[in-house]
């Protein structure tokens, strides 16, 4: 026995345009409520045949007026668990109707009016015991998002909840064969109290009050051999009462898996391990496709429109996993060096650089010479917040790596004319003035402010910047 | 206290059937979820898994060996036996048997050979 | 079948050094049959680590495991002399239930 527990996230438009009208209206105000129907195994019966595993209804949510003008938000929901409680064995692999209700509030004569809004529907596989499974399910323009889980009542435990729990008789351990319950370390395993006279030898149970059969044995209390023989081979001193057992097949013989699952014998049982596209058991379920919109989070999903094929999610930026199940969280790669803070928007990655850094990931240090090469001679200059390369004469730009027009500040005085040179630059002074950049006037007497003209220059020809 | 002992010919000849008992005590064969497997080792080399019964009469074998593997028990008076039909050298080894018990796993029920006995060397030889 | 790979066969290890040994699944294993055994010369093998990281009982706390699907290690914080031995891991999840061919661990 158990409880197969419900949590509706959130219901609403779905993605993409058409986004349906709200239900409710400031002139029929309503509330909305769920129902779940369960059925064991992966029926695919009509909703309307009954829910064999169980059903149930949730209370009624908060009303809910729409605003005029306003997108149909995601609507107000009922609180707590829709919870279904199964009186016998979890069958692990189940199919699953929810219905979301609309209960409108106006004056209608006779009391509240009820429509349905949506329905969704699926098959799954789901271990009890097991953690909180999530889903997201499409009906027309609706999106519903659910989380959903079974568990077992104690004393049951295990996957199907048919293993038994009691408290412990002793202090320190449990009886021969009976092991913990976990997570009730306290209790132990009780033995299944199988059907009356069931053989202890040949026959098991799963719950209470059955008698299964082993291989080779049949009958109510498997009891009876599925053949016997003359013993040619005796089988040990056990069978000397039985008479010979023909020994039964093997679990694999005669390959229980459907669909092209490959079988394997396991301890106690056997293994299917299923083609693409298939699982359950006996590879008996066809897979999840896009239909059943499994992606999270705004991934798309391609392929998958057949059962044989499986699908894709392409997450959307900030999402990862199988289904686009897990946010990514990419600040924890630490993608903002020299003590840049991350902000992960979700859409994009931001870094806010510290005083000094630039860059889209702060990786530029302005104030730092280090690495910063001048070309052509120049000499790098820090401060202000910034690098500069102070230039060699003849080149400029940021890294000195442009060649400069070195006339274009003129630099001959007292109206000299400035000639460019592969070298450098070229005064040619005025009359009256001499010196590299025609700095200096020649005085009336013929002598220069200067000491002596180098040889082969007279005072009044162009100076050549050395 | 679990202890197991096999037994065994010691030596036989190629082509003849090699019968080993395990007899074992400090647990039943009558007990949900308890088993008695085989292993072999040949001398300097690695184990080698033949066959297991549970308590409830299922059996597995290696499907390698199939053909030529029995494996019965005697609830009552503890005790395992294995048989290989058709013996050459390469069956030449040390054979162990071993509990299986069940052990607690993540999901479902799960088994480890828990306790071994001391191995019982066989030879096979002409 | 799944064939179990363990490395490296041989290795050799200071008093007091960290040691890992890796056994790797041809295909995927649950990790709740996958076990380690330690055998010792002229003895039994005996259960040291079950469902992949549980000691058994009397192995010391310096062992551990862990691993999942094709890959399990087995490591020792700090060898110590009875440690030496050779480790087989042991796959109990599908017929033919197989172990590796061993890791021997000696003392340097």
């Known amino acids: 026995a158990g409880v197969f527990e419900l949590q509706i996230h959130s219901f609403g438009p779905g993605p993409g345009p058409g986004a349906p009208r709200s239900p409710c209206s400031a002139r029929l105000p309503c509330r909305l409520f769920f129902r779940v129907c369960l059925k064991p195994g992966l029926s695919e019966e009509a909703a309307e045949s009954p829910c064999a595993l169980g059903a149930a209804l949730s209370a009624r949510g908060p009303v809910y007026t729409e605003q005029p003008g306003a997108p149909a938000p995601d609507l107000p929901l009922p609180d707590g668990l829709l919870q279904v409680p199964f009186r016998d064995a979890w069958p692990g692999t189940f199919s699953f109707i929810i219905e979301t209700w609309r209960e409108e509030l106006g004056d209608q004569i006779g009391g509240p009016a009820w429509s349905l809004l949506a329905r969704v529907a699926g098959r799954r596989r789901l271990a009890a015991g097991g953690p909180w499974a999530r889903d997201i399910q499409r009906a027309g323009a609706w999106e519903l998002r659910f989380s959903y889980r079974a568990r077992c009542e104690p004393p049951a435990v295990g996957t199907a909840c048919t293993r038994l729990c009691r408290p412990r008789s002793a202090p320190s351990r449990c009886g021969p064969g009976l092991r913990p319950c976990a997570p009730l370390e306290d209790e132990c395993e009780a033995p299944l109290v199988c059907r009356a006279g069931c053989s202890p030898e040949h026959g098991f149970c799963e719950q209470p009050g059955e008698c299964r059969c082993l291989e080779g044995w049949t009958g109510p209390l498997c009891t009876v051999p599925v053949s016997t023989s003359s013993c040619l081979s005796p089988r040990g001193p056990s069978s000397a009462t039985t008479g010979c057992l023909v020994p039964g097949p093997g679990p694999c013989d005669g390959n229980p898996c459907a669909n092209g699952g490959s079988c394997s014998e396991t301890p106690r049982s056997f293994e299917c391990t299923c083609p693409r596209g298939f699982y359950g058991l006996r590879c008996e379920v066809s897979g999840v496709t896009c239909a059943d919109g499994p992606c999270f989070n705004g991934g798309l999903c391609v392929g998958g429109a057949d059962p044989d094929s499986a699908y894709i999610c392409h997450c959307p930026p900030g999402f990862q996993g199988s289904n686009c199940e897990k946010r990514v969280d990419r600040c924890s790669l630490q993608p903002c060096r020299n003590g840049g803070l991350c902000l992960d928007l979700g859409h994009a990655l931001r870094c806010r650089c510290r005083a000094g850094f630039a860059g889209p990931r702060c990786e530029h240090d302005l104030d730092d010479c280090a690495g910063r090469a001048c070309a052509n001679g120049g000499t790098c200059v820090e401060g202000g917040g910034a690098h500069r390369c102070s230039c060699a004469l003849g080149f400029g730009g940021r890294d000195c790596r442009e060649r400069a027009d070195p006339c274009a500040a003129r630099p001959c005085a007292h109206g000299g004319r400035c000639y460019a040179h592969f070298s450098g630059l070229v005064c040619a002074c005025a009359p009256g003035y001499m010196g590299a950049r025609c700095e200096f006037p020649v005085h009336p007497d013929g002598a220069s402010a200067l000491p002596a003209a180098p040889p082969g220059l007279r005072p009044g020809d162009p100076q050549r910047y050395l | 206290q679990v202890t197991l002992k096999e037994s065994g010919p010691g030596i036989l000849q190629p082509s003849q059937t090699l019968s080993l008992t395990c007899s074992f005590s400090?647990?039943?064969?009558?007990?949900?979820?308890?088993?008695v497997g085989w292993i072999r080792q040949p001398s300097g080399k690695g184990l080698e898994w033949l066959a297991l019964i549970w308590w409830d009469d299922v059996k597995r074998y290696h499907p390698a060996l199939k053909s030529r593997l029995t494996i019965s028990k005697d609830t009552s008076s503890s005790q395992v036996f294995l048989k290989i039909a058709s013996v050459d050298t390469a069956d030449t080894a040390t054979y162990y048997c071993?509990?299986?018990?069940?052990?607690?796993?993540?999901?479902?029920?799960?088994?480890?050979?828990?306790?071994w006995g001391q191995g019982t060397s066989v030879t096979v030889s002409s | 079948q799944t064939v179990l790979t363990q490395s490296p066969a041989i290795m050799s290890a200071s008093l007091g050094e960290r040691v890992t040994m890796t056994c790797t699944a041809s295909s995927s294993v649950n990790s709740s049959s996958l076990h380690w055994y330690q055998q010792k010369p002229g003895s039994s093998p005996k259960l040291w680590i079950y469902?992949?990281?549980n000691l058994a009982s009397g192995v010391p706390a310096r062992f551990s495991g862990s691993g999942s699907g094709t890959s399990y290690s087995l490591t020792i914080s700090s060898m110590e002399a009875e440690d030496a031995a050779t480790y087989y891991c042991?796959?109990?999840?599908?017929?033919?239930?197989?172990f590796g061919s061993g890791t021997k661990l000696e003392i340097k």
């Open positions: 071993a509990r299986i018990a069940e052990v607690t796993g993540q999901v479902g029920l799960h088994y480890a050979m828990d306790y």
């Open positions: 400090g647990f039943s064969l009558s007990t949900s979820g308890m088993g």
């Open positions: 042991h796959q109990f999840h599908r017929s033919p239930f197989t």
């Open positions: 469902t992949t990281s």
